[in-house]
Amino acid sequence: MADGSSDAAREPRPAPAPIRRRSSNYRAYATEPHAKKKSKISASRKLQLKTLLLQIAKQELEREAEERRGEKGRALSTRCQPLELAGLGFAELQDLCRQLHARVDKVDEERYDIEAKVTKNITEIADLTQKIFDLRGKFKRPTLRRVRISADAMMQALLGARAKESLDLRAHLKQVKKEDTEKENREVGDWRKNIDALSGMEGRKKKFES
């Protein structure tokens, strides 16, 4: 934090003389890539964050898998009793095998019936969905755009409400002070509108068309 206080103590630099540019330069200025904004987070820190996020995601997946295993175990323990063989001989074990096979056959029959019902339902749902589309007319899906997601948002998505309490990542980051960007006096005119127009998808399209 010492750096911060020394910055505040320094005298502000005098602004450089305004540079006049010819209007022919404006198009090039708008279309050429701008000087990259200096990232707040260093590359190594970004990598560290990514690794941390992946670790958390991996832990979550492992926990979910463990929960599923436990759930399966609980479900099986209610459906399948432990074998009680004490005092049972060859005759009973033979009969028990027959009983268990009969039970398996019954369960298989039930499973087959359920599968048949499910297949029937799926077919019906598909038919109804098709009818809905036919009634609506052609349905056009909106094109999906790629969205940049911040580390905070990613943590929020991964951990939900726990994100805040588990790790406030930003608190651990070294604050990098923004350097004062040189402010230029630019002519007031249509060029600003041109830049706005050209910076979006329309602008790129026009650039490729020209």
């Epitope: 049972l88 060859f90 033979q94 009983q99």
Partner: antibody, heavy 121, light 107 residues
Framework: EVQMVESGGGLLKPGGSLKLSCAAS????????MSWVRQTPEKRLEWVAT????????FYPDSVKGRFTISRDNAKNTLYLQMLSLRSEDTAMYYC??????????????WGQGSSVTVSS | DIQMTQTSSSLSASLGDRVTISCRAS??????LNWYQQKPDGTIKLLIY???RLHSGVSSRFSGSGSGTDYSLTISNLEQEDIATYFC????????TFDTGTKLELK
């Protein structure tokens, strides 16, 4: 000392129902399978039912299947035989017996004194 | 069902005699055979299990043998307390079945 005491027998009409009980003592009841065996008036022994140590599995001859139900309460060390739709041929002395096995050979190693059931119109 | 049959329903012997009771199964029961004794008062006791194994507390005067479908119980040196009915039982297949029993009497 291993002991089994049957109770609940009696005289009843065909089609009637009855529940026999067998109180076991002198051994860890929940570790053993148990059986009911009956002896007809002609002195023939007939196996009636067997239940596994935890009560999950039961075995019956065709003659009683669907009419008789063997059950147990390990907390009370008690074995039961629920008898429904009783017939005259079910008239017998009903014995409760402990099961054990040796290399796949199962046997009734201890028997109770029996409880008499008479089905007559 | 496996049928169990004894050669005789009753047998007369004198005290001190060696007595053999036979039992036959309608099919192979691979030594899964047990012998029981029923006293005149109705009490039933296990004598022999798995063809030849002597149950705890049973006198060594009792012995069992056999294989396949043919089995036998032998009482050496018959005593008064041995006067009872003897049953064989197969443990090979459900339903478990007993024979009709052999009543041992004194001559």
């Amino acid at each position: 000392e291993v002991q089994m005491v049957e109770s609940g027998g009696g005289l009843l009409k065909p089609g009637g129902s009855l529940k026999l009980s067998c109180a076991a003592s002198g051994f860890t009841y929940s570790n053993y399978a148990m059986s009911w065996v009956r002896q007809t008036p002609e002195k023939r022994l007939e196996w009636v039912a067997t239940i596994s140590s935890g009560g999950s599995y039961s075995f019956y001859p065709d003659s009683v299947k669907g009419r008789f139900t063997i059950s147990r309460d390990n907390a009370k060390n008690t074995l039961y035989l629920q008898m429904l739709s009783l017939r005259s041929e079910d008239t017998a002395m009903y014995y409760c017996a402990r099961r054990d096995n040796y290399f796949g050979s199962s046997f009734m190693d201890y028997w109770g004194q029996g409880s008499s059931v008479t089905v007559s119109s | 069902d496996i049928q169990m049959t004894q050669t005789s329903s009753s047998l007369s012997a004198s005290l001190g005699d060696r007595v053999t009771i036979s039992c036959r199964a309608s099919q192979e029961i691979t030594n899964y055979l047990n012998w029981y004794q029923q006293k005149p008062d109705g009490t039933i006791k296990l004598l022999i299990y798995y063809t030849s194994r002597l149950h705890s507390g049973v006198s060594s005067r009792f012995s069992g043998s056999g294989s396949g479908t043919d089995y036998s119980l032998t009482i050496s040196n018959l005593e008064q307390e041995d006067i009872a009915t003897y049953f064989c039982q197969q443990g090979h297949t459900i339903p478990l079945t007993f024979d009709t029993g052999t009543k041992l009497e004194l001559k």
